[in-house]
Interface confidence: medium
Amino acid sequence: CKAMHVAQPAVVLASSRGIASFVCEYASPGKATEVRVTVLRQADSQVTEVCAATYMMGNELTFLDDSICTGTSSGNQVNLTIQGLRAMDTGLYICKVELMYPPPYYLGIGNGTQIYVIDPEPCPDSDF
C-alpha cells in the first residue's frame, strides 16, 4: 500500500435545503483505471461511512440509488454532493481515495471538510 495526497476544503456550509458540496482532489502517481471514493464522517471520535463508490477513469462517478451522495469526476478531481443533511449531521467529512487498479494500490485520506448544517427556522404562521 502506497500513500497518496488528498486535498479537500476545510469548511463548507450546507444550504438551507440540507445540501453540501465539496471537491476532493487526489494526486495520482500513476495511471489508474479504477478509483474508489469513500466519504467518512467523524463526530465525537466516532467514524462512520457515509457513502462509497468505485468508478472508472473516463467514466462518470455513480453512487448507488439509495445513497445520500451524488458526484461527478473529472481527471483527478471528484465533486461530491451530500443531501438530506440536518443540524445533527454537522461534523467532519473525510474523503478517502483508493487507486484500485492496476497495481500498486494507493491510498489517500484527506484532512476532512467540516460541514456545518443549520436547520431552517420554521415559517411563522401568517394570516395573509
Partner: nanobody, 115 residues
Framework: EVQLLESGGGLVQPGGSLRLSCAAS????????MAWYRQAPGKGLELVAG???????NYVDSVKGRFTISRDNSKNMVYLQMNSLRAEDTAVYYC?????????WGQGTLVTVSS
C-alpha cells in the same frame, strides 16, 4: 460477495463477431460499475470497456467503433459485443464488477482470432 461467470468466448476468424456474456450473482445490489478487461498472451491486463449503473460507457481507443458494452440490470448481466475482430484482440477476457465495497473478477473466457 459477488460472483461473476463469463461465457461466449471461442475461436473466430478475423473480421468475425462474438458476444461475451457475464452473469452476476450474490450481492449484486452493491454493484455500480461493470467492465471487461483482457489479457493478451504475454501482456498485462487492459481495461477494454466499462459501463456504470446509468448506462454510461467508456472504451479503450483500440476497440472504439468495434466493441459495444451493454448492461441488463433486470437480468444482472453485462455483455460485450465484439465486431470486426482482429488477431490482436486474441486474449482472455475477464468480467469485472465494482461497487462501494465490491471488487470482483470473473474466471475469464478465451477469445482467439485466427484464420
Amino acid at each position: 460477495e459477488v460472483q461473476l461467470l463469463e461465457s461466449g468466448g471461442g475461436l473466430v476468424q478475423p473480421g468475425g463477431s462474438l458476444r461475451l456474456s457475464c452473469a452476476a450473482s450474490g450481492s449484486i445490489f452493491s454493484i455500480n460499475h461493470m467492465a471487461w478487461y483482457r489479457q493478451a498472451p504475454g501482456k498485462g491486463l487492459e481495461l477494454v470497456a466499462g459501463v456504470n449503473s446509468r448506462g454510461t460507457t467508456n472504451y479503450v481507443d483500440s476497440v472504439k467503433g468495434r466493441f459495444t458494452i451493454s448492461r441488463d440490470n433486470s437480468k444482472n448481466m453485462v455483455y460485450l459485443q465484439m465486431n470486426s475482430l482482429r488477431a490482436e484482440d486474441t486474449a482472455v477476457y475477464y468480467c469485472r464488477a465494482l461497487g462501494g465495497a465490491v471488487a470482483a473478477w470473473g474466471q475469464g473466457t478465451l477469445v482467439t482470432v485466427s484464420s
